[in-house]
Interface confidence: low
């Protein structure tokens, strides 16, 4: 038993032309989540086939609203790992599908709407207990960067999570033939439980429940000696009780090594020595070597020490990836301050600063009102990396250059008509109302609710509001 873990590092536009449109907008904010589906073996099955190894959904990511005019950035991701528990042995080879889903948060009838944004798939070989493996997959114009690993859940250990560890019975050492369970040095490997009755002398197992026979023995429990009546075996006769041992087919019979590989027997299997340019257990893989120049961006190629590792790239600063093909994302360190937009140009980092900020890293807060004039008696007000003008009466706009329409706010009450005037506005009141804004009713007996109108004005005449 164990857990497959997937860490999504980024999801955003891939390199090259044709950057995708942001999946979210101010009108339609959204958030992302991911689904992973695992299948055993190097399966070519359709995406819809069951996720026999398991599946998992991530949490929802932060709500994202596109910034108008900005390029589609890497989108905000959910926190944490996607974890797919597996109950049985880890198969070593597996197929994966990772889907990026968008949850739209607009005014949807019946709740949020989901839509599939991207799907990537692949087939990999991975030993449990190994380090994080990194990957980049592209789906259309999108690029997904992620890491994955398989780890065993105690007491299971090993590359397939089939060996078991148990606390030590004796304080000093493990039992005969049993090793400590690194890194848990206080625990010991538990013996594999072979098939019940499997001969301890002539049988062994590499998986729980099996019984594999050493040479010269056969039967379901490896208790039957291989014998013939005529002793024609090149290995010669054995004791009278077991007859003559006839070896079974040797592991190198028929030469399992492809592409001119030479086979040599090992105690329990065989090993292929592959010619230059071929790799794998049976030399079946035609691989790239340093002679093919696989390291990009000035990476130095080193011949691999492993039979199954063709080469290793020694990457120069600023590059990573198995072929030094990935530029280190220096913008992930968020070097631009005060909300500046980071651009990695390869040879240099560039910060595009928000209004009101300057400097290589947008570290300088500009004096927004310096050198700026607000027209027509307006005064400049600073704040938040921007400036605005507080305009004098009768003026508006960013720099107080626009004459304000004093009637725009419909200031005259009770149906009074508004007239713009050089010194403000004038309300012509409807019959029965008076006041600067026509706000006071005239009493039926002709007396107003206010003191008598100023000289020269009768109730009902236009009232000038100064």
């Amino acid at each position: 038993a164990g857990v497959f873990e997937l860490q999504i590092h980024s999801f955003g536009p891939g390199p090259g032309p044709g950057a995708p449109r942001s999946p979210c907008s101010a009108r339609l904010p959204c958030r992302l989540f991911f689904r992973v589906c695992l299948k055993p073996g190097l399966s070519e099955e359709a995406a819809e086939s069951p996720c026999a190894l398991g599946a998992a959904l991530s949490a929802r990511g932060p709500v994202y609203t596109e910034q108008p005019g900005a390029p589609a950035p890497d989108l905000p991701l959910p926190d944490g790992l996607l974890q797919v528990p597996f109950r049985d042995a880890w198969p070593g080879t597996f197929s994966f599908i990772i889907e990026t889903w968008r949850e739209e948060l607009g005014d949807q009838i019946g709740g949020p709407a989901w839509s599939l944004l991207a799907r990537v798939a692949g087939r990999r070989r991975l030993a449990a207990g190994g380090p994080w493996a990194r990957d980049i997959q592209r789906a259309g114009a999108w690029e997904l960067r992620f890491s994955y690993r398989a780890r065993c859940e105690p007491p299971a250990v090993g590359t397939a999570c089939t060996r078991l560890c148990r606390p030590r019975s004796a304080p000093s050492r493990c039992g005969p033939g049993l090793r400590p369970c690194a890194p848990l040095e206080d625990e010991c490997e538990a013996p594999l439980v072979c098939r019940a009755g499997c001969s301890p002398e002539h049988g062994f197992c590499e998986q729980p429940g099996e019984c594999r026979c050493l040479e010269g023995w056969t039967g379901p429990l490896c208790t039957v000696p291989v014998s013939t009546s005529s002793c024609l075996s090149p290995r010669g006769p054995s004791s009278a009780t077991t007859g003559c041992l006839v070896p079974g087919p040797g592991p190198c019979d028929g030469n399992p090594c492809a592409n001119g590989g030479s086979c040599s027997e090992t105690p329990r299997s065989f090993e292929c020595t592959c010619p230059r340019g071929f790799y794998g257990l049976r030399c079946e893989v035609s691989g790239v070597t340093c002679a093919d120049g696989p390291c990009f961006n000035g990476g130095l190629c080193v011949g691999g020490a492993d039979p199954d590792s063709a080469y290793i790239c020694h990457c120069p600063p600023g590059f990573q990836g198995s072929n030094c093909e990935k530029r280190v994302d220096r913008c992930s360190l968020q070097p631009c301050r005060n909300g500046g937009l980071c651009l990695d140009l390869g040879h240099a980092l560039r910060c595009r600063c928000r209004a009101g900020f300057a400097g290589p890293r947008c570290e300088h807060d500009l004096d927004d009102c310096a050198g700026r004039a607000c027209a027509n008696g307006g005064t400049c007000v600073e704040g938040g990396g921007a400036h605005r003008c507080s305009c004098a009466l009768g003026f508006g706009g960013r720099d107080c250059r626009e004459r304000a329409d004093p009637c725009a706010a419909r200031p005259c009450a009770h149906g009074g008509r508004c007239y713009a005037h050089f010194s403000g506005l004038v309300c012509a009141c409807a019959p029965g109302y008076m006041g600067a804004r026509c706000e006071f009713p005239v009493h039926p007996d002709g007396a107003s609710a206010l003191p008598a109108a100023p000289p020269g004005l009768r109730p009902g005449d236009p009232q000038r509001y100064l």
């Epitope: 692949g122 087939r123 990999r124 070989r125 991975l126 207990g129 190994g130 380090p131 994080w132 493996a133 990194r134 990957d135 994955y148 690194a182 890194p183 790799y279 794998g280 079946e284 893989v285 035609s286 691989g287 990476g299 080193v302 691999g304 492993d306 199954d308 590792s309 063709a310 290793i312 790239c313 020694h314 990457c315 990573q320 990836g321 198995s322 072929n323 030094c324």
Partner: nanobody, 126 residues
Framework: EVQLVESGGGLVQPGGSLRLSCAAS????????IGWVRRAPGKGEELVAR????????RYADSVKGRFTISADTSKNTAYLQMNSLRAEDTAVYYC???????????????????SGQGTLVTVSS
């Protein structure tokens, strides 16, 4: 800051032994594979051995199998290369290198060395 500092090199007679040390700082060696790479005069670089300290997984170049042993002490954040039965052809500058593992695909394991030390010279001569 990531640093790898090698020590233990020197002059030794054929058949002799040396133990190289690689002290790592700025990262935890448990999270990476650590390898020894050597560069002999007039030759290319050769990856000699590699260890993944978390589970003790080791690999060796055919030319050193049975003679060299790579090990690691995670409590000291240090990797070692025990070199026995040294030969003249083992003469080289030995570098300690940190590897990123990128997974197994297209038929082989993918690693990349992202940091290495300044190296220590091993000379095997009578």
């Amino acid at each position: 800051e990531v640093q790898l500092v090698e020590s233990g090199g020197g002059l030794v007679q054929p058949g002799g032994s040396l133990r190289l040390s690689c002290a790592a700082s700025g990262f935890n060696i448990e999270h990476y594979s650590i390898g020894w790479v050597r560069r002999a005069p007039g030759k290319g670089e050769e990856l000699v051995a590699r260890i993944y300290p978390t589970n003790g997984y080791t690999r060796y170049a055919d030319s050193v199998k049975g003679r060299f042993t790579i090990s690691a002490d995670t409590s000291k954040n240090t990797a070692y290369l025990q070199m026995n039965s040294l030969r003249a052809e083992d003469t080289a500058v030995y570098y300690c290198a940190r590897h990123h593992y990128y997974g197994y695909h297209s038929g082989y394991h993918h690693y990349a060395i992202d940091y290495s030390g300044q190296g220590t010279l091993v000379t095997v001569s009578s």
